[in-house]
């Protein structure tokens, strides 16, 4: 049961972190216009990884699109391609798991299959986690690094007494949205895969051995292996019905993995 | 078709207050930038206050500030200009004007007069 | 505040003939988000209210003839009436719509020579 809820809570809120993701990567606030300590004007800038936008206080905004791909900083493109890797690596990952719950049944999928898939998305949705808070802390590190360098000559100066004001970019709420949706997608995965270690079933399978005492014919069975499948005890805790009609094929499929003297 | 129609406008004692009402029509009213600009007799025009689309910030210059209060009631799709310590330099005509591109003001009322005399 | 600074102060121009009015800002008007220079220009005739011309400093309003023009950037503007018509006497003005306060320069009046 533990183990179910683990991977089920553990999918939900990889689901939610990947959401997070794809929506920070299509977000316009990656950097947005500071507005502390700077001349009031009446538009505010701010940028995302595809576009950059204006909205002026008249009511009017406008964005325009990066329509140049050689013509963008290198560490742009890095930052566009650690999030579309993100996403890719965490819809996969999502694909994979909806397969790998326990709750949903697939054929004859065995339990070590299902364990080995559960631990798959989980490592993907690390990766993507990782890739995503990759991707957005380098985005940050750029602005931290241009604030201060646009800082140190916020005002050039032009022709004597002309002034023209530098504008200065901060984090936008991308940033965070990417920071937070990395963190849930990285223990999603995280979630995922310590509940693979609850499915997995163990690699030995005590095999049951007759034992012929005189005038009896007793087939012991040892058990007490609760990581054991199959034998003893455990055979119990065994969910193998998972409730409602089952056809002739599908229970068929699951004694191949018990041992029957 | 975009209407601004200004009233409210009238003689008023120095130290006075006045309230200017703008009842615009033709076009989404909440969307929009809206502003106050004034016009002295045979002189030139001046900025009095905008009032941001959407998030409804509010600007105004220093020869006003803290006098003057610019409000929208959207559902009414009125602009008001309160105007409190009225001075004899306050005397003008008052434009309302509804922004667009470039924070420019393509559509403008007739206007009201506001002349502050004692 | 931003000082806007029109040049001349009134402009006596034959029918037909070019008519150029020039404003110059303390400061750049230039928006480094979308590369716009955020000034206006507007045309104000007696017992009238404004009327916006140009704005962005060169994108001519609709239903604004075309010899009207705005050209400029940065704090260095102009406003050019290519051939001059009887009906654009009136008082021009220039307006930074970049920083609070949006000042307006002083105007420039426009007469026939």
């Known amino acids: 049961m533990a183990v179910t809820a683990c991977q089920g809570l553990g999918f939900v809120v990889s689901l939610i972190g990947i959401a997070g993701i794809i929506a920070a990567t299509c977000m316009d606030q990656w950097s947005t216009q500071d507005l502390y300590n700077n001349p009031v004007t009446a538009v505010f800038n701010y940028q995302g990884l595809w576009r950059s936008c204006v909205r002026e206080s008249s009511g009017f905004t406008e964005c325009r699109g990066y329509f140049t791909l050689l013509g963008l900083p290198a560490m742009l493109q890095a930052v566009r391609a650690l999030m579309i890797v993100g996403i890719v690596l965490g819809a996969i990952g999502l694909l994979v798991s909806i397969f790998a719950l326990k709750c949903i049944r697939i054929g004859s999928m065995e339990d070590s299959a299902k364990a080995n898939m559960t631990l798959t998305s989980g490592i993907m949705f690390i990766v993507s986690g990782l890739c995503a808070i990759a991707g957005v802390s380098v985005f940050a590190n750029m602005l931290v690094t241009n604030f201060w360098m646009s800082t140190a000559n916020m005002y050039t100066g032009m022709g004597g007494m002309v002034q023209t004001v530098q504008t200065r970019y901060t984090f936008g709420a991308a940033l965070f949205v990417g920071w937070v949706a990395g963190g849930l997608t990285l223990i999603g995965g995280v979630m995922m895969c310590i509940a693979c270690r609850g499915l997995a079933p163990e690699e030995t399978n005590y095999k049951a051995v007759s034992y012929h005492a005189s005038g009896h014919s007793v087939a012991y069975k040892p058990g007490g292996f609760k990581a054991s499948t199959g034998f003893g005890s455990n055979t119990k805790n065994k969910k193998i019905y998972d409730g409602g009609a089952r056809t002739e094929d599908e229970v068929q499929s699951y004694p191949s993995k018990h041992d029957y003297v | 078709e975009v209407q601004l129609v200004e009233s409210g406008g009238g003689l008023v004692k120095p130290g006075g207050s006045l309230r200017l009402s703008c009842a615009a029509s033709g076009f989404t009213f909440s969307s929009y930038g809206m502003s106050w600009v004034r016009q002295a007799p045979g002189k030139g025009l001046e900025w009095v206050s905008t009032?941001?689309?959407?998030?409804?910030?509010?600007y105004y210059p220093d020869s006003v500030k803290g006098r003057f209060t610019i409000s929208r009631d959207n559902a009414k799709n009125s602009l008001y200009l309160q105007m409190n310590s009225l001075r004899a330099e306050d005397t003008a005509v008052y434009y309302c004007?509804?922004?667009?591109?470039?924070?420019?003001?393509?559509?403008w009322g007739q206007g009201t007069l506001v002349t502050v005399s004692s | 505040d931003i000082v806007m600074t029109q040049s001349p102060d009134s402009l006596a121009v034959s029918l037909g003939e070019r008519a150029t009015i020039n404003c110059k800002s303390s400061?750049?008007?230039?928006?480094?988000?979308?590369?716009?220079?955020?000034l206006t220009w507007y045309q104000q005739k007696p017992g009238q209210p404004p009327k916006l011309l140009i704005y962005w400093a060169s994108t001519r309003e609709s239903g604004v003839p075309d010899r009207f023009s705005g050209s400029g950037s940065g704090t260095d503007f102009t406003l050019t009436i290519s051939s001059l018509q009887a009906e654009d006497v009136a008082v021009y003005y220039c307006q930074n719509n970049y920083f609070y306060p949006f000042t307006f320069g002083q105007g420039t009046k426009l007469e026939i020579k």
């Open positions: 009032i941001s689309g959407g998030d409804s910030y509010t």
């Open positions: 004007a509804r922004s667009y591109n470039g924070n420019s003001l393509p559509y």
């Open positions: 400061q750049s008007l230039l928006n480094s988000g979308n590369q716009r220079n955020y």
